[in-house]
């Protein structure tokens, strides 16, 4: 098996999850 | 420094089992929500799983092509998050990164699934 | 799903000079909070992919200035003020708004 290693990819110490939403719900088909 | 530490990857045969894992330094992990991506040639960038926090009763989501045959889990204890596959397809090739929310991303592990 | 189109496909931009990348949702992307999940990522030549906006316009820590993001609801563009070097590699948007989380194609960024 193969290990690789990621560095920060921003600045910030502390991973930001304010790009999901909170609660999602599935796309719903139209 | 943030640094998340993908292993597990490598060559397996169609319908086997392998387990990824990823350890996170660096950050608090605990308040993480965590994520599986896998890129390849074909599909482009594909989500797999999220695992939610303690804070959202370590909620797990899942794209529909791998569900039932997907896990995702963590130990927030050594700031880990897996992904156990099994029954694997020829399509599951790609590199699989760990990414804590789309935030932070680390290197890809590549799996291949191949007879 | 929610299916993300990108264009252009790629671009050739002289250093210095500005760069444009649409994206297109198939469903608005604004959840019930008021807030739109909508992310751009970059992806550097053999490495992995890096966010550099969230929620339509919110830059990531430590990401240029030169880098910003605008739209609503369904149709959504980064910017590059002034493409530099270093910007070379594939753009990606992404929502996060509902499940799956869904990618587009992607935009690759050449320097002329």
């Known amino acids: 098996s193969e290990t690789t290693t990621g560095t920060s990819s921003n600045s910030s110490q502390s991973t930001s999850n304010s790009g999901l939403a909170p609660n999602p719900t599935n796309a719903t088909t139209k | 420094e943030v640094k998340f530490e993908e292993s597990g990857g490598g060559l397996v045969q169609p319908g086997g089992s392998i387990k990824l894992s990823c350890a996170a330094s660096?950050?608090?992990?605990?308040?993480?929500?965590m994520d599986w991506v896998r890129q390849s040639p074909e599909k482009g960038l594909e989500w797999v799983a999220e695992?939610?926090?303690?804070?959202?009763?370590?909620?797990?989501y899942y794209a529909e092509s791998v569900k039932g045959r997907f896990t995702i889990s963590r130990d927030d204890s050594k700031s880990r998050v897996y992904l156990q596959m099994n029954n694997l397809r020829t399509e599951d090739t790609g590199i699989y990164y760990c990414t804590g929310a789309m935030d932070y991303w680390g290197q890809g592990t590549s799996v291949t699934v191949s007879s | 799903d929610i299916v993300m189109t990108q264009t252009p496909l790629s671009l050739s931009v002289t250093i210095g000079q500005p760069a444009s990348i649409s994206c297109k949702s198939s469903q608005s992307l604004l959840y019930s909070n008021g807030k739109t999940y909508l992310n751009w990522l970059q992806q550097r030549p053999g490495q992995s992919p890096k966010r550099l906006i969230y929620q339509v316009s919110k830059l990531d820590p430590g990401i240029p200035d030169r880098f910003s993001g605008s739209g609503s609801e369904t149709d959504f563009t980064l910017k590059i003020s002034r493409v530099e070097a270093e910007d070379l590699g594939i753009y990606y948007c992404?929502?996060?708004?509902?499940?799956?989380?869904?990618f587009g194609g992607g935009t690759k960024l050449e320097i002329k």
């Open positions: 660096g950050v608090p992990f605990s308040g993480a929500w």
């Open positions: 992404m929502q996060g708004t509902y499940l799956p989380w869904t």
């Open positions: 695992i939610r926090d303690k804070t959202k009763n370590y909620v797990t």
